[in-house]
């Protein structure tokens, strides 16, 4: 009797279990009682990444330089092109369809994780003992200057945005 289900890498059509086309190939004709499934390789600018019965291959993704994109990995007949962003930019989504400039960490915040082509800068507030007085996409919070190691004393306390101000020790004794 005609099958109602087929094995892995097969599909059911016209009461026949036909072989799926392998990745990198598209379906030209279904199998029949007397013939195999016929498949053809995808052209150079196309791909199919699964066992399939698609009659058209998918176009490789275009990494549009106008959107700040560049090719990270060229596509094959079995894989799509992978785009990444130019230096100083990162993807706006997982599929990386466009890029935006990396965020800078404002004064009072330092870089916890430097941005990559696919992730933005991660900032963190400078904890007590650390400061950042610049807006930067690279600089971490810096520690306050240690006045003691310079035989100096704190004349002005530091904040998360400013370093301490050191000054000479008062030599007058009470």
């Amino acid at each position: 009797e005609p099958p109602t289900a087929c094995r892995e890498k097969q599909y059911l059509i016209n009461s026949q279990c036909c072989s799926l086309c392998q990745p990198g190939q598209k379906l030209v004709s279904d199998c029949t009682e007397f013939t195999e499934t016929e498949c053809l390789p995808c052209s150079e600018s196309e791909f199919l990444d699964t066992w399939n019965r698609e009659t058209r291959c998918h176009q490789h993704k275009y990494c549009d330089p106008n959107l700040g994109l560049q090719v990270q990995q060229k596509g094959t007949s079995e894989t799509d092109t992978i785009c990444t962003c130019e230096e100083g930019l990162h993807c706006t989504s997982e599929s990386c369809e466009s890029c935006v400039p990396h965020r800078s960490c404002l004064p009072g915040f330092g870089v916890k994780q430097i941005a990559t082509g696919v992730s933005d800068t991660i900032c963190e507030p400078c904890p007590v003992g650390f400061f950042s007085n610049v807006s930067s996409a690279f600089e971490k919070c810096r520690p306050w200057t240690s006045c003691e190691t310079k035989d100096l004393v704190v004349q002005q306390a530091g904040t998360n945005k400013t370093d301490v101000v050191c000054g000479p020790q008062d030599r007058q004794r009470a």
């Epitope: 004709s29 009682e33 007397f34």
Partner: antibody, heavy 112, light 112 residues
């Protein structure tokens, strides 16, 4: 339902060309399948002559050398057989077939 | 070419009794994908061949379940579990794995 119907002259002179046409209804010959010509000499078995595929490409039985040509007319949903330089040995019932469906056959006699 | 040899060439069976026909190929009919394109046909007197079994063991639509096919590689069998009067005719095997397609010489089934 798929139906195939052979047509053509029943009598061909030796050395001439035998020409038959198969008209298909119920299925487009350019959709899929291989469209075959098969013959059966009187009192003998079946012999595959060749086919034309849904895409128009061919395959022929080498035993018929280069005497056989199968072509098609997709606008009429027909495919045709030409067999050149016939002899009495080509006298047979000629069938067109998709293999799951066959024409009723047409008898061709080669005689002067 | 794949030469197809059928045995026996004739068979006389009492209605209700089983019948078995063998078809042996001179080369394996299994292709590189592991599929085997061996088919069985019945040609009733005065008619075109009709498909019974395709791909070794698949019954074509409308074929009674008393017909079954089996085998692999080079050896194949058609079985009729209980022969009926309407089963008379010539049974052919046909391989379409290799070009040229080739038929067995036929087995004539008669009713006792």
């Amino acid at each position: 339902e798929v139906q195939l119907q052979e047509s053509g002259p029943g009598l061909v002179k030796p050395s001439e060309t035998l020409s038959l046409t198969c008209t298909v209804s119920g299925y487009s010959i350019s959709s899929n399948y291989y469209w075959n010509w098969i013959r059966q000499p009187p009192g003998k078995g079946l012999e595959w002559m060749g086919y034309i595929r849904y895409d128009g490409s061919n395959n022929y039985n080498p035993s018929l050398k280069s005497r056989v040509t199968i072509s098609r007319d997709t606008s009429k949903n027909q495919f045709s057989l030409k067999l050149s330089s016939v002899t009495a040995a080509d006298t047979a019932v000629y069938y067109c077939a998709r293999l799951d469906y066959w024409g009723q056959g047409t008898t061709v006699t080669v005689s002067s | 070419d794949a030469v197809m040899t059928q045995t026996p060439l004739s068979l006389s069976v009492t209605p209700g009794q089983p019948a078995s026909i063998s078809c042996r190929s001179s080369q394996s009919l299994e292709n590189t994908n592991g599929n085997t394109f061996l088919n069985w046909f019945l040609q009733k007197p005065g008619q075109s061949p009709q498909l019974l079994i395709y791909r070794v063991s698949n019954r074509f639509s409308g074929v009674p379940d008393r017909f079954s096919g089996s085998g692999s590689g080079t050896d194949f069998t058609l079985k009729i579990s209980r022969v009926e009067a309407e089963d008379v005719g010539v049974y052919f095997c046909l391989q379409v794995t290799h070009v040229p397609f080739t038929f067995g010489q036929g087995t004539k089934l008669e009713i006792k």
